[in-house]
């Protein structure tokens, strides 16, 4: 043999009970002591430090803390140094060293020692991870190292968590003993934070010890708080709240169209939108995620705003007889009432639509002119004016005529035409044509689609000449002999050389 000792490195006992520290030791066989003596020291192995003597086989002298509380259960002659401590109190917690005394110079303090822990609560062992929906085993373990007092275990607050199974007394690796009771159950998310207790009682004594463990049940997120659809006026402040219940707290993410707007590990997350614009109208998603799962919900944000200025697309220049299609469109929320007016007359209207199509089949010159597209909802009104130009061949209007006054003759040629025509006055009798470019004789004035050209003739009195007015544009030409109103002497201007 050789010098060596075997005892548990740590051992526990309930306050007020006892503890048996199992201990064996060995020494070289050749020492052959007649009597083996031994000493148990408390907290220090160095005799020089005068550590409290827990037990000494040679004498009854022990430290006052251990008076009447220490006894050797083992037989030192059989190399068994098992120590019994009774009525243990917290101050007895610490290190216990054994010193073998074989006589002569052979006293040996073993470096192996036992650390006594005085406890007053059962140890509830919950697995490091408890997941909702997955069966779990919770154990209650208490030291059972006192041969005089055996603990009995019972569970507290386990109603609905299954029936406990008592495993009984189990030997641990280093020779210490524990009493174990098991509880098997499938936890729900509601069990999170539940206080589960275990009670150790000692029959025929008043000793009773309770320990509690709070269940830390892990479970996936469920979104429990979220706005219903939100309507907001453009420029206002909008708060979108998402709250989730999970353990551990989730990573909450606000997203829109795949873009992360805000995220945080929290139980609730507020998305603040300052001065909302129509561009922020849409579907917002809240995603809650932890290691155990995820949940997501969406909320629609509707940004209410007055119509934008309508845009008008289509043919703005048309030839008489063609069909004209004009599209007036806008954007607003809610959709507007769209109306197309011409000279205060409603031509077309739609309710709660964002575009209005105006069809004008076989346009005539009367369709030429200014039109208005008006968009309106409860938040405002916007209008856009547009002009439709109808092109047609000249039409000589009936008010065209010639009239004599003193020494002049004035001829009016009134033409309706689009585009503007060129006008010429022909005096067949003189074989003369006067164009509007000859400002000395011809004055032209246009009002809308009507062009009035006035030819002024000065000269001697003669018979009134025939005057033919010809109006021409790209769509055609029209001629009219201008009638005279009254037969007067005329003054003729000499035209030409």
């Amino acid at each position: 043999g050789h010098w060596g000792a075997w005892m548990p490195s740590s051992i526990s006992a309930f306050e007020g009970t006892c503890v048996s520290i199992p201990c064996r030791f060995d020494f070289p066989d050749e020492l052959r002591p007649a009597v083996v003596h031994g000493v148990w020291y408390f907290n220090s192995p160095y005799p020089k430090n005068y550590p409290p003597v827990v037990f000494k086989s040679r004498t009854q002298v022990v430290h006052e803390s251990f008076q009447g509380r220490s006894r050797l259960l083992g037989d030192l002659g059989l190399r068994n140094c098992t120590l019994l401590l009774s009525n243990v109190s917290p101050e007895l917690g610490g290190k216990y060293y054994f010193r073998g005394d074989l006589g002569g110079y052979n006293q040996y303090t073993f470096s192996e020692h036992s650390v006594l822990d005085i406890v007053n609560t059962p140890n509830i062992v919950v697995p490091p991870e408890v997941v909702a929906g997955t069966e779990v085993e919770v154990s209650c373990m208490v030291p059972d190292n006192c041969p005089e007092l055996r603990p009995e275990l019972s569970w507290l607050g386990h109603e609905g968590l299954g029936e406990p199974a008592v495993l009984g007394r189990l030997r641990e690796d280093e020779g210490t003993w524990v009493q174990v009771s098991l509880l098997h159950f499938v936890p729900t998310r509601e069990a999170n934070g539940h206080r589960l207790g275990c009670q150790a009682s000692f029959p025929n004594t008043t000793l009773q010890f309770e320990g509690y463990a709070s269940m830390d049940v892990k479970y996936p997120p469920v979104i429990v708080e979220m706005n219903s659809s939100v309507e907001a006026i453009e420029g206002s402040h909008v708060s979108l709240l998402c709250g989730a219940d999970s353990n551990p707290p989730p990573l909450l993410t606000w997203m829109r169209d795949g873009t992360v707007l805000r995220e945080a590990v929290a139980e609730s997350l507020l998305l603040e939108l300052e001065e909302v614009t129509p561009a922020e109208d849409g579907v917002y998603a809240c995603l809650a995620e932890n290691a155990y799962g995820q949940d997501n919900r969406t909320v629609g944000l509707s940004v209410m705003y007055a119509p934008w200025k309508p845009t008008v697309n289509g043919t703005m220049v048309a030839v008489e007889g063609e069909t004209v299609s004009i599209l007036c469109s806008t954007q607003s929320n809610p959709d507007p009432i769209l109306t197309i007016f011409k000279e205060k007359q409603i031509l077309s209207t739609v309710i709660y639509e964002s575009e209005l199509q105006l069809e004008l089949p076989a346009v005539s010159p009367e369709d030429d002119g200014e039109y208005w597209c008006v968009a309106e909802n409860q938040y405002g009104q916007r209008a856009t004016a547009f002009n439709l130009s109808v092109e047609f061949a000249p039409v000589l209007l009936l008010e065209s005529h010639c009239a004599a006054a003193r020494d002049t003759v004035q001829c009016l040629c009134v033409v309706k035409s689009n585009p503007e025509p060129s006008v010429a006055f022909e005096l067949p009798s003189r074989n003369v044509t006067v164009n509007e470019s000859e400002r000395e004789f011809v004055y032209s004035e246009r009002s809308g689609l009507v062009l009035t050209s006035i030819l002024t003739l000065r000269g001697q009195a003669q018979a009134p000449p025939r005057v033919i007015c010809t109006a021409r544009n790209l769509y055609g030409a029209k001629s009219l002999e201008l009638p005279f109103q009254g037969a007067h002497r005329l003054m003729w201007a000499k035209i030409g050389p």
Partner: antibody, heavy 126, light 112 residues
Framework: QVQLVQSGSELKKPGASVKVSCKAS????????MNWVRQAPGQGLEWMGW????????TYADDFTGRFVFSLDTSVSTAYLQISSLKAEDTAVYYC???????????????????WGQGTLVTVSS | DIVMTQSPDSLAVSLGERATINCKSS????????????LAWYQQKPGQPPKLLIY???TRESGVPDRFSGSGSGTDFTLTISSLQAEDVAVYYC????????FGQGTKLEIK
């Protein structure tokens, strides 16, 4: 040089007590253990036990427990043997003898007694 | 305890002659951890304390004449004085210091 000088002879009546001293010099007192050996008149040597001068811990041979006490005064490098309730059979020469000690960690190894005191005769007689 | 038995109890040897004293232990005094024999020999002259001659069964203490030698291992040991001198007259004790310390009963050496 190493010297162990013991106190002088003592004549005591039965039931009395006696305290024998052993003053060491010439070496470091606490590096050596101090043994006590008894030699009755015309008899052999009997080891009574020893005291660890470093820790102050005494060890008594099985026949010398109870009435025999080893003590120290390290300040004056002196070891003491006290015998109480003296009996006639305690009459003997009492020797102190040192032994080297090799310390390692919390333990030590003791070796042979190399230097002895001159002895103190204790006579117990009525 | 380990019992030490010396032989003979007394011995008379002529000056200059070899003297041999034997010592037998009831159990081995050889320590396995260091392979040393925990045995010593002492010389005690009348009115004097014992004097260490030999330790570890065969190691001579400083200052001891080389005519003294020790031998043996385990349980059987011998002290030899190769050439007896007049000043060697004394009682010789063997002593084990492995376990609880014990001495032999002593051997009285005289001049023949």
């Amino acid at each position: 040089q190493v010297q162990l000088v013991q106190s002088g002879s003592e004549l005591k009546k039965p039931g009395a007590s006696v305290k024998v001293s052993c003053k060491a010099s010439g070496y470091t007192f606490t590096n050596y253990g101090m043994n006590w050996v008894r030699q009755a008149p015309g008899q052999g040597l009997e080891w009574m036990g020893w005291i660890n001068t470093y820790t102050g811990e005494p060890t008594y041979a099985d026949d010398f427990t109870g009435r025999f006490v080893f003590s120290l005064d390290t300040s004056v490098s002196t070891a003491y043997l006290q015998i109480s309730s003296l009996k006639a059979e305690d009459t003997a020469v009492y020797y102190c003898a040192r032994n080297p000690i090799n310390y390692y960690g919390i333990n030590y190894e003791g070796y042979v007694m190399d230097y002895w005191g001159q002895g103190t005769l204790v006579t117990v007689s009525s | 305890d380990i019992v030490m038995t010396q032989s003979p109890d007394s011995l008379a040897v002529s000056l200059g002659e070899r003297a041999t004293i034997n010592c037998k232990s009831s159990h081995s005094v050889l320590y396995s951890s260091n392979q040393k024999n925990y045995l010593a020999w002492y010389q005690q002259k009348p009115g004097q304390p014992p004097k260490l001659l030999i330790y570890w069964a065969s190691t001579r203490e400083s200052g001891v004449p080389d005519r003294f030698s020790g031998s043996g291992s385990g349980t059987d040991f011998t002290l030899t004085i190769s050439s007896l001198q007049a000043e060697d007259v004394a009682v010789y004790y063997c002593h084990q210091y492995l376990s609880s310390l014990t001495f032999g009963q002593g051997t009285k050496l005289e001049i023949k």
